[in-house]
């Protein structure tokens, strides 16, 4: 028979390779079936039969075709800082992500292994840089002329508000405090420019701190705790 | 990044041959088949044949059997498609692009080299 | 050898139009289709593998759908660097064939 007709199994000819979804069987010396993802062999091929292909057993799996005497195992149940966004089936593995609030400190081919809590940037301190899937909260010291006054991994500095007359002058966690019953007006949060305020506190315009790099965890570290990172605080 | 490059334009003449070069890079040369993909002008695509660059073994469709050979130097991750006995039907852009055997798909191609085969 | 054709050589959409392009087995190919992007002067694109798998980096406004004989590559809403010739191709015994492509214009 032409190769393009052969059943499985075949010799191939000299210097051909087997066709889709097959595999050369180097004790055969035949080209054999693979088994499709969910199966694996069963009974490997021999000169005159195929290869016997049988489901995966519960908790494992096989994701492409194959010729595996045994299926692989699914990773553990996820952790309760995780979410399962892929379940176990024959032909895939499970997949655990971090939960909303955590990142993915130490990743794995699929998934994460082991989840952080996000970084929350403490009072006078704001988001520099928010906390992906893969990479934590970074903080800096709120500048002259805007405040934080919460604990938050997502809330950044803002604005003073401007006053006509100022009663307490705000600070990096504190907003101003206007006597007249309402401020002229209110900066929008995240304005880049600060205009000159209308109020007795002087404010020097001057570069923002670099963000603060300091890892927000010490579980990767073999020495033991160490101090939370400048601008933010353990849970 | 993953890719093939081929090398330049040929123009031969009828019953002459051609041999067409694609260079990989950004992967394991020799995990990969590469396939060979052919388009006349204003056609549609027409597979050649594969080369499994770890051993060199082929697969050609029955249509080429005879006029074609595909080789590879793995030293160089180059894979190298010659086609013989030339004829006006053969002009036509040649692709290299890697291939996947169990779903049989494509899924990085070279730019392509233009073969003309005109007397 | 397996043929494959396509319902139509070339289709007229625009910009946001949800636009299918179906292409059909002469015989059953199970899953086995794959769509491709060609552009001129461009390399060919793979986008749709095994009927409906998403080649990665591919955008989620492209699908695929089918079986046996009968394919669809879905476009949801159609953005102006979509405009291209499509093929599919079937990937279930060899020969592996193409289809002739279709041509997606701007209308």
């Known amino acids: 028979l032409p190769a393009q007709v052969a059943f499985t199994p075949y010799a191939p000819e000299p210097g051909s390779t087997c066709r889709l979804r097959e595999y050369y069987d180097q004790t055969a010396q035949m080209c054999c079936s693979k088994c499709s993802p969910g199966q694996h062999a069963k009974v490997f091929c021999t000169k005159t039969s195929d290869t016997v292909c049988d489901s995966c057993e519960d908790s494992t799996y096989t994701q492409l075709w194959n010729w595996v005497p045994e299926c692989l195992s699914c990773g553990s149940r996820c952790s309760s800082d995780q979410v399962e966004t892929q379940a176990c089936t024959r032909e895939q593995n499970r997949i655990c992500t971090c939960r909303p609030g955590w990142y993915c400190a130490l990743s794995k081919q699929e998934g994460c292994r082991l989840c952080a809590p996000l970084r929350k940037c403490r009072p006078g301190f704001g988001v520099a840089r928010p906390g992906t899937e893969t990479s934590d909260v970074v903080c800096k010291p709120c500048a002259p002329g805007t405040f934080s006054n919460t604990t938050s991994s997502t809330d950044i500095c803002r604005p003073h508000q401007i006053c006509n007359v100022v009663a307490i002058p705000g600070n990096a966690s504190m907003d101003a405090v206007c006597t007249s019953t309402s401020p002229t007006r209110s900066m929008a949060p995240g304005a880049v420019h600060l205009p000159q305020p209308v109020s007795t506190r002087s404010q020097h315009t001057q570069p923002t701190p670099e963000p603060s790099t300091a890892p927000s965890t010490s579980f990767l570290l073999p020495m033991g705790p160490s101090p939370p990172a400048e601008g933010s605080t353990g849970d | 990044q993953v890719q093939l490059v081929q090398s330049g334009a040929e123009v031969k003449k009828p019953g002459a041959s051609v041999k067409v070069s694609c260079k990989a890079s950004g992967y394991t040369f020799i995990t990969y088949d590469i396939n060979w993909v052919r388009q006349a002008t204003g056609q549609g695509l027409e597979w050649i044949g594969w080369?499994?660059?770890?051993?060199?073994?082929?697969q050609y469709a029955q249509k080429f059997q005879g006029r074609v050979t595909m080789t590879r130097n793995t030293s160089i991750s180059t894979a190298y498609m010659e086609l013989s006995s030339l004829r006006s039907e053969d002009t036509a852009v040649y692709y290299c692009a890697r291939g996947d055997r169990d779903y049989g798909y494509f899924d990085v191609w070279g730019q392509g080299t233009t073969v003309t085969v005109s007397s | 050898d397996i043929q494959m054709t396509p319902s139509t050589s070339s289709l007229s959409a625009s910009v946001g139009d949800r636009v299918t392009i179906t292409c059909r087995a002469s015989?059953?190919?199970?899953?086995?289709l794959n769509w491709y992007q060609q552009k001129p002067g461009k390399a060919v694109k793979l986008l749709i593998y095994?009927?409906?798998k998403l080649h990665s980096g591919v955008p989620s406004r492209f699908s695929g759908s089918g079986s046996g004989t009968d394919f669809t590559l879905t476009i949801s809403s159609l953005q102006p660097e979509d405009f291209a010739t499509y093929y599919c191709q079937q990937g279930n015994t060899l020969p592996l064939t193409f289809g002739g492509g279709t041509k997606l214009e701007l209308k």
């Open positions: 095994f009927k409906s």
């Open positions: 015989q059953d190919i199970s899953n086995y």
């Open positions: 080369i499994y660059p770890r051993d060199g073994n082929t």
